[in-house]
């Protein structure tokens, strides 16, 4: 059975900067999980593993590692941040994060992270992705559940 | 090697109170929950509560909601279980007991000696 | 609450043979997969021991002349060969919901 439950809460802040010589844009993504541990015994977060993905390209990578014991019956809110980049085949978007006469600059992107937890020599990974808004515009802090985005079809499995 | 060892025997009055203790060793206490259980002479026995140590969150069984409480000291890895407005229907062995360690490890897996309550005027 | 009920309430068995034990839930104790049945032995003075967690898996440093088995409702606690050690009492414990409970207990006798 699943006795560890990770759900992913959705963007805590997207913090931006850009290289105008490069026409680059850098993404700090800072992501909120809740995991919840439903066993009688503390188990051990060993790793989170995160990746973003714009357009099915990945554009940042990101691992945390010995993060954090959760005890027995218990649940832990965790932030982790993905730092990305968005240049080379995708710097079209650049004009699009920049331009002045447009107030929201949303952009969808696909989160990905993965959690590992052990407990008594045994491991455990559990998956999630979401495609979320984020403003490549402006320094952005969300509401928990604000940058969620519905209405994306899912890829084919 | 894990061991609770439980308060020694109470004789009370009816209608007072009654704390038992259960010291733990030979783990971490705040890794794991203890569960307190009932068992009237002769007779089977009854999941009371239980308690997680790190936190101090509580889940009673509704028969001994007003009956029992739960409470838990980290510095001395000690466990303790309140019954209050005693009947003689409270004389029992009281045990605790330690969750094991398998998938949700609901199930009782090191036990204390048990602590004897008689109620009696 | 989920009501186990075991029977026989007690057996009498001669050394050397079978002893089967049966608990029977209320409803269905099964989640996610696993059956959240569990066997303990229980001597005169002592604490409960547990022998079988999980329906079938035997709980390290018990003999496997004790064996588990069920599915459903209906679950199985097998002895054999029956030793002069294993006089006792036997109690199901169901661990699906809250409140947990146990079966009422079959004592065995050796002839």
């Known amino acids: 059975p699943r006795s560890i439950d990770v759900k992913y809460i959705g963007v805590k802040s997207a913090y931006v900067s850009y290289d105008v010589q490069k026409r680059t844009i850098y993404l700090n993504i800072t992501n909120t999980l809740n995991i919840t541990n439903n066993n009688y015994y503390s188990v051990e977060v060993e790793n989170i593993t995160a990746q973003v993905q714009f357009s099915k390209t990945v554009i940042g990578k990101a691992r945390l590692n010995n993060i954090t014991i959760i005890g027995p019956l218990d649940m832990k809110q965790i932030d982790y941040t993905v730092p990305t980049v968005i240049a080379e085949e995708m710097s079209y978007m650049y004009d699009f994060c920049t331009l002045i006469s447009i107030k929201v600059h949303n952009i969808v992107l696909m989160m990905q992270v993965t959690v590992t937890t052990t407990y008594f020599g045994h491991s455990e990974q559990i998956s999630q992705e979401r495609y979320q808004y984020v403003d490549c515009g402006r320094n952005t802090t969300y509401q928990l559940g604000q940058s969620e985005y519905l209405n994306v079809l899912q890829p084919q499995q | 090697e894990v061991q609770l060892q439980q308060s020694g025997p109470e004789l009370v009055k009816p209608g007072a109170s009654v704390k038992m203790s259960c010291k733990a060793s030979?783990?971490?206490?705040?890794?794991?929950?203890m569960h307190w259980l009932k068992q009237k002479p002769g007779q089977g026995l009854e999941w009371i509560a239980h308690?997680?140590?790190?936190?101090?969150?509580?889940k009673y069984n509704e028969k001994f909601k007003g009956k029992a409480t739960l409470t838990s000291d980290r510095s001395s890895s000690t466990a303790y279980m309140e019954l209050n407005s005693l009947t003689s229907e409270d004389s029992a062995i009281y045990y605790c007991?330690?969750?094991?360690?398998f998938g949700r490890g609901d199930y009782f897996h090191y036990w204390g000696q048990g602590t004897t309550v008689t109620v009696s005027s | 609450d989920i009501v186990l009920t075991q029977s026989p309430a007690s057996l009498a068995v001669s050394l050397g043979q079978r002893a089967t034990i049966s608990c029977r839930a209320s409803?269905?104790?099964?989640?996610?997969?696993?059956?959240?049945i569990h066997w303990y032995q229980q001597k005169p003075g002592q604490p409960p021991k547990l022998l079988i967690y999980?329906?079938?898996n035997l709980e390290s440093g018990v003999p496997a002349r004790f064996s588990g088995s069920g599915s459903g409702t209906d679950f199985t606690l097998n002895i054999h060969p029956v030793e002069e050690e294993d006089a006792a009492t036997y109690y199901c414990?169901?661990?699906?919901?809250?409140?947990?409970?146990f079966g009422g207990g079959a004592r065995l006798e050796i002839k």
């Open positions: 999980l329906t079938s």
């Open positions: 030979g783990y971490t206490f705040t890794n794991y929950v």
């Open positions: 007991a330690r969750s094991g360690q």
């Open positions: 308690i997680t140590p790190h936190n101090d969150g509580t």
């Open positions: 409803k269905s104790v099964s989640t996610s997969g696993s059956i959240y």
């Open positions: 414990q169901h661990s699906g919901e809250l409140p947990w409970t």
